[in-house]
Interface confidence: low
Amino acid sequence: NQDLPVIKCVLINHKNNDSSVGKSSSYPMVSESPEDLGCALRPQSSGTVYEAAAVEVDVSASITLQVLVDAPGNISCLWVFKHSSLNCQPHFDLQNRGVVSMVILKMTETQAGEYLLFIQSEATNYTILFTVSIRNTLLYTLRRPYFRKMENQDALVCISESVPEPIVEWVLCDSQGESCKEESPAVVKKEEKVLHELFGTDIRCCARNELGRECTRLFTIDLNQTPQTTLPQLFLKVGEPLWIRCKAVHVNHGFGLTWELENKALEEGNYFEMSTYSTNRTMIRILFAFVSSVARNDTGYYTCSSSKHPSQSALVTIVEKGFINATNSSEDYEIDQYEEFCFSVRFKAYPQIRCTWTFSRKSFPCEQKGLDNGYSISKFCNHKHQPGEYIFHAENDDAQFTKMFTLNIRRKPQVLAEASASQASCFSDGYPLPSWTWKKCSDKSPNCTEEITEGVWNRKANRKVFGQWVSSSTLNMSEAIKGFLVKCCAYNSLGTSCETILLNSPGPFPFIQDN
């Protein structure tokens, strides 16, 4: 049928990158190249119906369904989803094609289903059908990797029992401290399950699949390093494997290492030793202590001793369930408009947490950093000096934790006014919460110095969206002030702001801002 328009249906997947998260734009900011959904004519259907290829979307993903219509003249359209009509506003691109879009932000179960687009052009009417479903990730898992000794070899295997099967990589670093960050040039990555080079300073294994990335660090005591001020602590859950590496370097091979648990030597089969010469001909020895499946009685102080170094210990604690320890009392902060400030939460947790910072229903990425004392810290600095409630939420397999923060920004009040036939109201969100005065302007008082005290009602209310306090003052109108100009002023320690209102004037009320 030559009357039928040329139609193209596309899917645009939007990346939830940090530049768009937290912005209140109605459209995601960054997108991948559009994916063609075909849009074939559906045979044996009453009327002209095009069907797009089925769309599978991850939970919380943001997408746009888009139709490009190559037809002469204007088009009008209507979206229908679950028997509800949705607004449709076509526009035209540079090639003069009609473009109709449906944006789905942060996909949820309720947004899955059939989206019908009815288009009316000058020549014909037709329908386009999109079927959107949520990708079934219920079966997906991502488990933290663990270590096993390779049979008959001095090597470790990294295992992560995850679905879909993860990519496993070793992350190795031979320098100290900060320079072992992931992006550092000192870090070497090996995408393999087996690792033979076990002498490095920092050894981690990471597993990644569609659900993200999880890492496990090989717990190490280095006898050549000054011991930490607090005893290193390792947490494990019952049934998990225990691996501790003791490492020591000496000028020659004339030294040995031993492991003890609570002053008793570890049983044969629960340790193995490796040694090598380093480039400067010093000897490096490592001694692994391992238990394939820990029980409660494996809790205790594990001490690595050397005939040539001071011994060092670590406390291994076996728990039945994971935990998150932190103080959950809410905290209030008050800062200047340009003061640098970060929220921070210090916590101890096992297994490692996943966390988010939330403000005004928007979520922000959460970074955590390990401290020397076994605690971790998460900081949030990206508040852009917006006052309100900030929420830190953390969870692991067994525990959840939420902490609330309130941020107050010190600033001079700004006054907004509104009036009705019976009263005038002024609102301000300055901080500290302002006090109010009302003044009457008259012939006797052209500078508006005559104070009004009768009929004034002040209150503070929580603006729920931001968790931000707003102060308001309402003046009930009396015959004495009808037809006069009145002035409401809000003041705090940073300054004063006023608005002038003409009472009882017909039509819209004029407001004169007066700072």
Partner: nanobody, 111 residues
Amino acid sequence: QVQLQESGGGLVQPGGSLRLSCAASGSTFGRNYIDWYRQAPGKQREWVAQITSGGNTHYEPSLKGRFTISRDNAKNTAYLQMNSLKPEDTAVYYCRILDYWGQGTQVTVSS
């Protein structure tokens, strides 16, 4: 929850001095600003001075030079040292942290 308790007020002769204290309970004391306010009979409450978490001080211009604000984070306490007092300094003095206020302490300057 922060609780504030002012003390140190009293009757003093013109030209005399007083040192007001503001004791706070609550863990966020050191992180927050402290303000002193005062309210004279029949008048609006007015701001007197402020000390920031970093120890920077700000004063109501007409009081600068006579009043000094300070803080001791270890004791969770803020102070207002008032010298060369005048009758017009007679008021109830309040301290404030965030949106928490103390009950106030009365200062009367009279011969």
